[in-house]
């Protein structure tokens, strides 16, 4: 299998984003999609049957979806670095996807770069 | 006020099942998801599973995994739980428990219905 | 499945005390862990979640801390009324799992 991610992306401060990871080229089964930031705190969970658990820390900030994916709002300097998507599957087990993310002062138009990681 | 009243004690024979339920009052009970949880006499507690109303997302414990059905009746915002081919080891006190909004943990929890197998 | 130790079943305190439970799980829940008060003929009651954010209502005497695999809730300064069992549970993954349980009692 493999993850493809949005890549690098870049947004506006107090603007928001959507990091979207994709799992593809394998049958196996998502139970659940961990989110995490830069150092490893969680954002928020979506297992397969029981929906979204959103961290208390950005429940305010943290919108789920689109899909399994995560949009992140109100977006500060200090939400620049890195964020990872981790798909807990069966029967293949774990898929890891990263993304880094860049908080802009100034106007500078949002885009992405895709990539895969194997 | 959020309120679970949950259905009355159960007296069953081995090999019967058993059918508890846990009506709900005082929040939207779609947007919530509904836990099960055993707790054996002075022993701990133990997940049964979890139903989400609203696209009826069920997780089950699979050490309960087709003995333990779990429904609800949107209509009475009315949860279920049914436990077939009872055996001793099913005596417990039976707790449905509100899972927090988008979170997994349980904010408020029925009384508790306790179920006794014996012949 | 994930294994809770809560590793002392029973902790004798005195009132106005500050007493420490501790749990372990065996491997890493980030900070998916939640604490639940049950007190005798009652049901569980929900302290902390997220390992250190306090529910709605709860005096701010309980305190939860520790992430990964160590997490302690702590009473700063026990009332009688705290004398209960309490239970971690994690929420990281299914089945979530609780932990065998401490039950607070007085000297």
């Known amino acids: 299998g493999t993850i493809e991610t949005t890549g690098n992306i870049s947004a506006k401060k107090g603007g928001s984003v959507i990091l979207q990871c994709h799992l593809s080229s394998t049958m196996a089964q998502v139970t659940q999609v961990n989110w995490e930031q830069h150092d490893h705190s969680l954002l928020a969970i979506r297992n397969a049957e029981l929906g979204w658990h959103i961290y208390p820390a950005f429940k305010d900030r943290v919108a789920p979806g689109p899909g399994l994916g995560l949009t992140l709002q109100s977006l500060t300097m200090n939400d620049t670095g890195e964020y990872f998507c981790t798909y807990h599957t069966y029967p293949d087990g774990t898929y890891r996807g990263r993304i880094f993310l860049e908080v802009l002062e100034s106007s500078v138009a949002e885009h992405s770069a895709r990539f895969q990681i194997p | 006020e959020v309120q679970l009243q949950q259905s009355g004690p159960e007296l069953v024979k081995p090999g019967a099942s058993v059918k508890i339920s846990c009506k709900t009052s005082?929040?939207?009970?779609?947007?919530?998801?509904m836990h099960w949880v055993k707790q054996s006499h002075g022993k701990s507690l133990e997940w049964i599973g979890g139903?989400?109303?609203?696209?009826?997302?069920?997780s089950y414990n699979q050490k309960f995994k087709g003995r333990a059905t779990l429904a609800v009746d949107k209509s009475s915002n009315t949860a279920y739980m049914e436990l077939r081919s009872l055996t001793s080891e099913d005596s417990a006190v039976y707790y449905c428990?509100?899972?927090?909004?988008?979170?997994?943990?349980?904010?408020?929890w029925g009384q508790g219905t306790t179920l006794t197998v014996s012949s | 499945d994930i294994v809770l130790t809560q590793s002392h079943k029973f902790m004798s305190t005195s009132v106005g005390d500050r007493v420490s439970i501790t749990c372990k799980a065996s491997?890493?829940?980030?900070?998916?862990v939640a604490w639940y008060q049950q007190k005798s003929g009652q049901s569980p009651k929900l302290l902390i979640y997220?390992?250190?954010y306090r529910n709605t209502g709860v005096p701010d005497r309980f305190t939860g801390s520790g992430s990964g695999t160590d997490f302690t809730f702590t009473i700063d300064s026990v009332q009688a009324e705290d004398l209960a069992v309490y239970f971690c549970?994690?929420?990281?993954?299914?089945?979530?799992?609780f932990g065998t349980g401490t039950k607070l009692e007085l000297k």
């Open positions: 005082g929040y939207t009970f779609t947007e919530f998801t």
């Open positions: 428990a509100r899972g927090a909004y988008y979170r997994y943990d349980a904010d408020y």
């Open positions: 491997q890493d829940v980030k900070t998916a």
């Open positions: 549970q994690q929420h990281y993954s299914t089945p979530f799992t």
């Open positions: 997220s390992a250190s």
């Open positions: 139903l989400k109303p609203d696209n009826g997302g069920i």
